[in-house]
Interface confidence: low
């Protein structure tokens, strides 16, 4: 069916980067400036995405592909195709509705985005804490407590709180 239709449809011959111009007896016209067609046989070209404001251009628009945006420094991409930009926080923090907040004791975040995660509970694996955790780093688990001198202990952090409706924290 596709093959039959394509033989009858002059627009099917129009390659990517062009459109089938009904105003010009269905000839293949190049996409106008700031527009593109990523597939052949299209009757219109799509308007190029413009990376404005907090968005910046990662890849320029061409006649066959849309522009791609990322975020200006201090922000990171969210959503499909970087449809939104969200504020960065520092390591050891997470973004809340009130801005960047330090991770609670027993949790850490080693990135500029995302949420604070609980420290690993070494004792669950029969190990002990070799290096204590910080706001920025998880604990490092070492040998089992039996292999260590008396007094070694594992850290069991409190469960992280949540901000309801938005994000597990």
């Amino acid at each position: 069916f596709e093959r039959t239709r394509s033989l009858q449809d002059p627009c099917s011959n129009c390659p990517a980067g062009t459109f089938c111009d009904n105003n010009r007896n269905q000839i293949c016209s190049p996409c106008p400036p700031n527009s593109f067609s990523s597939a052949g046989g299209q009757r219109t070209c799509d308007i190029c995405r413009q990376c404005k404001g907090v968005f910046r251009t990662r890849k320029e628009c061409s006649s066959t592909s849309n522009a791609e945006c990322d975020c200006t420094p201090g922000f990171h991409c969210l959503g499909a195709g970087c449809s939104m930009c969200e504020q960065d926080c520092k390591q050891g923090q997470e973004l809340t509705k009130k801005g960047c907040k330090d991770c609670c004791f027993g949790t850490f975040n080693d990135q500029k985005r995302g949420i604070c995660r609980p420290w690993t509970n070494c004792s669950l694996d029969g190990k002990s804490v070799l290096v204590n955790g910080t706001k920025e780093r998880d604990v490092v688990c070492g040998p089992s407590p039996a292999d260590l001198s008396p007094g070694a202990s594992s850290v069991t952090p409190p469960a992280p709180a949540r901000e309801p409706g938005h994000s597990p924290q």
Epitope: L78, E86, K97, E163, G165, H166
Partner: antibody, heavy 121, light 107 residues
């Protein structure tokens, strides 16, 4: 590409229950909240609740808390909304929509096509 | 629950005209407000989030403003494709609550 595909229309009797599904594809299911929003014919939008698939944490609108149950099946990337004790005023289109895990500015960036539930005796 | 009072409930405007829709919250919502556009038989589409941030791909003729309890959606020059119903949504507190909607028609 990202898609939320909802189950088909339902006709139910007052007092019965209905369970709607929302199958997600094209993204990491566990990294987004699934919200349920309904719209009665010719009326506005009403948020019913949401669920975080990673650990099934839920928030409910108190208006529906006793009648709505949100669940997920991570193996099939499907979210479910069950509404019990149906009454005629529950006749509405029910939408599922997602919000990003870390995103405090709740942008519902993708929506299902909606499921019409008709409650009639 | 936070109540969102949206006005007007319907609005008739000419093409090219500047259109303004307002939403008033029953308490301060700290700019946690989105605006949606919904066309008949379709799911809503987010236009604005955090009161004034335009979702990428939404035409720049749409803008949002406001703070505290009072918020505004403005269409600087009405186009045929803007004919739809518009809703505001507060998400400062659970449950998120929508305004009653504004049906926009061509004069």
């Amino acid at each position: 590409q990202v898609q939320l595909v909802q189950s088909g229309a339902e006709v139910k009797k007052p007092g019965s229950s209905v369970k709607l599904s929302c199958k997600a594809s094209g993204y990491t299911f566990s990294s987004y909240w699934i919200n349920w929003v309904r719209q009665a014919p010719g009326q506005g939008l009403e948020w019913m609740g949401n669920i975080y698939p990673s650990d099934s944490y839920t928030n409910y609108n108190q208006k529906f808390k006793d009648r709505v149950t949100l669940t997920v099946d991570k193996s099939t990337s499907t979210a479910y909304m069950e509404l019990s004790s149906l009454r005629s005023e529950d006749t509405a289109v029910y939408y599922c929509t997602r919000t990003w895990e870390f995103y405090y500015d709740s942008v519902f960036d993708y929506w299902g096509q909606g499921t019409l539930v008709t409650v009639s005796s | 629950d936070i109540q969102m009072t949206q006005s007007p409930s319907s609005l008739s405007a000419s093409l090219g005209e500047r259109v303004t829709i307002t939403c008033k919250a029953s308490q301060d919502i700290n700019s946690y407000l989105s605006w949606f556009q919904q066309k008949p038989g379709k799911a809503p589409k987010t236009l604005i989030y955090r009161a004034n941030r335009l979702v990428d791909g939404v035409p720049s003729r749409f803008s949002g403003s406001g703070s505290g309890q009072d918020y505004t959606l403005t269409i600087s020059s009405l186009q045929p494709e803007d004919i739809a119903t518009y809703y505001c949504l507060q998400y400062d507190e659970l449950p998120p609550t929508f305004g009653g909607g504004t049906k926009l028609e061509i004069k």
